[in-house]
Interface confidence: medium
């Protein structure tokens, strides 16, 4: 059976430590770098540009803008060449909650 | 070998020079020529992990791309009336 447009096989999930964590509360968005890079001297890029002053596993944006702050994020450790990428697009609002 | 994310009209598409591999998350629809995965409407908050198909020797050059949409379709504004 060949692959078709409207179907796809379930593939093995990657281990949780390789995933970014995205937390959104009000207008604040916090992106956490995957565990695989450890805790020391993390570098962040946004749309291939180095984010100055960001060296923690968490990258926090207090007033996230969907237009200006959505895009490609990457984090990596100096000791590990491999980068992890996240494409994030988020719409935020100050006084709202998300209901399922 | 990096997955690129494109938005056209109201939909989200992932593209590679080779083909897009879904690791987990939103299934998507494989479009002709296998280079593009249609993740559907962005208001449905597609999320998942994807990478470009590569040979074993080149797999280290094909990083994972996590996709995270949160379009707040189910967001409820809290004002004094809502809280009352």
């Amino acid at each position: 059976q060949d692959e078709d447009f409207k179907a796809s096989d379930d593939l093995t999930s990657i281990s949780p430590e390789k995933r970014f964590k995205v937390s959104i509360s009000g207008t604040e968005v916090v992106v956490t770098c995957p565990d695989v890079f450890g805790y020391d001297n993390i570098k962040w890029e946004k749309n291939d540009n180095l984010v100055e002053g960001a060296s923690n596993r968490e990258l926090s944006q207090k007033e996230f803008s969907e237009v200006d702050d959505s895009g490609y994020y990457a984090c990596y450790a100096d000791s590990i060449k491999e980068k992890s990428y996240l494409y994030l697009r988020a719409r935020v609002c100050a006084n709202c909650i998300e209901v399922n | 070998f990096k997955v690129s994310v494109e938005e056209l009209e109201d939909r989200v598409f992932l593209s590679c020079n080779t083909s897009v591999l879904r690791i987990e998350g939103t299934m998507g629809i494989q479009l002709p020529h296998s280079r593009t995965l249609d993740l559907g409407k962005r208001i449905l908050d597609p999320r998942g992990i994807y990478r470009c198909n590569a040979t074993e020797e080149q797999s280290d050059k094909a990083p994972y791309m996590q996709v995270y949409y949160r379009m707040c379709q189910n967001c409820v504004e809290l004002n004094s009336a809502t809280l009352a």
Partner: antibody, heavy 118, light 109 residues
Framework: ELTLQESGPGLVKPSQTLSLTCGVS?????????WNWVRQRPGRGLEWMGY?????NYNPAFQGRISITADTAKNQFSLQLRSMTTEDTAVYFC?????????????WGQGTLVTVSS | SYVLTQLPSKNVTLKQPAHITCGGD??????VHWYQQKLGQAPVLIIY???SRPTGIPERFSGANSGNTATLTISGALAEDEADYYC???????????FGEGTQLTVLR
């Protein structure tokens, strides 16, 4: 408005190579679209032959004797079909295929009849 | 490789509905395009992705696709709809476009 125009010989001898060109005006031959050749033998249906999009992809039925190239400077793409037989007598169409999100043949040439005969 | 089956010919009375079918193994899992080709002319796209109609194509043309059959429907056939109709899918296994053999529609006055 994009227009495609096939050109080439109307008559080819058996065992010879067919060379057809599709000139494009009102748009550019680039890698962002798929540039296809389709043929239709007399009284028969449409048969996809292959495309160029920077790289090429051919119908396995023609594999080994087909070549599609493009000259982006001249805004044209070409078909070469080797070892022609009378079975290759057909109307040959060039067609542009749209890219994401649609992928269908939106513009066609009017077709050129190629007869294989000695 | 993937095979699409169409009836060679179909007759329809003027202003009556016409249903042109295209059969294929689990075709409902694929996306189907339909082309109209009038005598001596190049094909024209009339339905894409099963049921979408390009700009300029009359509303009487519609499409559906499920199971092993895709269907092109002309709600009320006109004389100008007399043509050959071809279905098309992408065969992801062979990495090739596949056309049906075509159905010749005749509109009876």
């Amino acid at each position: 408005e994009l227009t495609l125009q096939e050109s080439g010989p109307g008559l080819v001898k058996p065992s010879q190579t067919l060379s057809l060109t599709c000139g494009v005006s009102g748009g550019s031959v680039t890698r962002s679209h798929y540039w296809n050749w389709v043929r239709q033998r007399p009284g028969r249906g449409l048969e996809w032959m292959g495309y160029w999009t920077g790289s090429t992809n051919y119908n396995p039925a023609f594999q080994g004797r087909i070549s599609i190239t493009a000259d982006t400077a001249k805004n044209q793409f070409s078909l070469q079909l080797r070892s022609m037989t009378t079975e290759d007598t057909a109307v040959y169409f060039c067609a542009r295929e749209t890219t994401i999100p649609t992928f269908f043949f939106d513009y066609w040439g009017q077709g050129t009849l190629v007869t294989v005969s000695s | 490789s993937y095979v699409l089956t169409q009836l060679p010919s179909k007759n329809v009375t003027l202003k009556q509905p016409a249903h042109i079918t295209c059969g294929g193994d689990n075709i409902g899992s694929k996306s189907v395009h339909w082309y109209q080709q009038k005598l001596g002319q190049a094909p024209v796209l009339i339905i894409y992705y099963d049921s979408s109609r390009p700009t300029g194509i009359p509303e009487r043309f519609s499409g559906a696709n499920s199971g092993n059959t895709a269907t092109l429907t002309i709600s009320g056939a006109l004389a100008e709809d007399e043509a050959d109709y071809y279905c098309q899918v992408w065969d992801s296994g062979a990495k090739a476009w596949v056309f049906g053999e075509g159905t010749q529609l005749t509109v009876l006055r």
